[in-house]
């Protein structure tokens, strides 16, 4: 199977690496743009240079293109406690990440909260916290794991998970049913 | 086709509890992060509480913080909201919601149901 190309892949894979075909002449092959910069107009003729200026503030290009524009940098979350790890220039983006003892929880691939690291009180610590991974604790006799903290077995309730981690704590528990509560 | 069902809402008393689930098909629901979001009546969408994919990352807004529980069974295809000390201005239709893949925030969801009414009144 041969895999499907977009047009300006089908335009640029006619041109030797680091160039790509004229918008209107196909047999003109332009220089591509440095990173931190972007086009403006493409060559004239063959073995012309292509017109790139550089990115207004504001605003980057990562790699080699022939962007009619360059990309808005990013802009680092702050609800969801994310910090400037390094500022936006014209050849890269805006790097953000997590203040000391946190780690990052990906939502999705482009959004990630920070989240304090667990301290695996009642419990000691199994993994420790990474920058994209909690701690992982291992919890003392008479406590249970629930969202990565150790919770004491008199609040297990019969129906949840932790009924087979706190086996000979559960018939003293007085709740029967779980309601949902934590 | 992916769809989403809620159940659960109804009238409740101030002060009152109520379990919301939402029954997932038509995609690997284990995969997703999934959330709830709902629309008082006048109002825009709010979001209330997302959990990942695995069910051990929660957040909740904190209008909701202390009082609403998200959860999820992987192995039944649902998602729940456990809702308790319930308010007037938690009137709402509640939405379980499905976040996108390359979401930049929590309303950038792809599916969404048809909605539960709560409404919390004496």
């Known amino acids: 199977l041969v895999p499907h190309l977009g047009d300006r892949e089908k335009r640029d894979s006619v041109c030797p690496q680091g160039k790509y075909i004229h918008p209107q002449n196909n047999s003109i092959c332009c220089t591509k743009c440095h990173k931190g910069t972007y086009l403006y107009n493409d060559c004239p003729g063959p073995g012309q240079d292509t017109d790139c200026r550089e990115c207004e503030s504001g605003s980057f290009t990562a790699s080699e293109n022939h962007l009619r524009h360059c990309l808005s940098c990013s802009k680092c979350r702050k609800e969801m406690g994310q910090v400037e790890i390094s500022s936006c220039t014209v050849d890269r983006d805006t790097v953000c990440g997590c203040r000391k003892n946190q780690y990052r929880h990906y939502w999705s691939e482009n959004l990630f909260q920070c989240f304090n690291c667990s301290l695996c009180l009642n419990g000691t610590v199994h993994l420790s916290c990474q920058e994209k991974q909690n701690t992982v604790c291992t919890c003392h006799a008479g406590f249970f794991l629930r969202e990565n903290e150790c919770v004491s077995c008199s609040n297990c309730k019969k129906s949840l998970e932790c009924t087979k981690l706190c086996l000979p704590q559960i018939e003293n528990v007085k709740g029967t049913e779980d309601s949902g509560t934590t | 086709e992916v769809q989403l069902l809620e159940s659960g809402g109804g009238l409740v008393q101030p002060g009152g509890s109520l379990r919301l689930s939402c029954a997932a098909s038509?995609?690997?629901?284990?995969?997703?992060?999934m959330l709830w979001v709902r629309q008082a009546p006048g109002k825009g969408l709010e979001w209330v509480s997302v959990i990942s994919a695995e069910g051990r990352t929660t957040y909740y807004a904190d209008s909701v913080k202390g009082r609403f529980t998200i959860s999820r069974d992987n192995s039944k295809n649902t998602l729940y909201l456990q809702m308790n000390s319930l308010r007037a201005e938690d009137t709402a239709v509640y939405y379980c919601?499905?976040?996108?893949?390359?979401?930049?925030?929590?309303?950038?969801?792809?599916?969404w149901g048809q909605g539960t009414l709560v409404t919390v009144s004496s």
């Open positions: 038509g995609f690997t629901f284990a995969n997703y992060t």
């Open positions: 919601a499905k976040l996108n893949m390359k979401a930049t925030n929590f309303k950038d969801f792809d599916y």
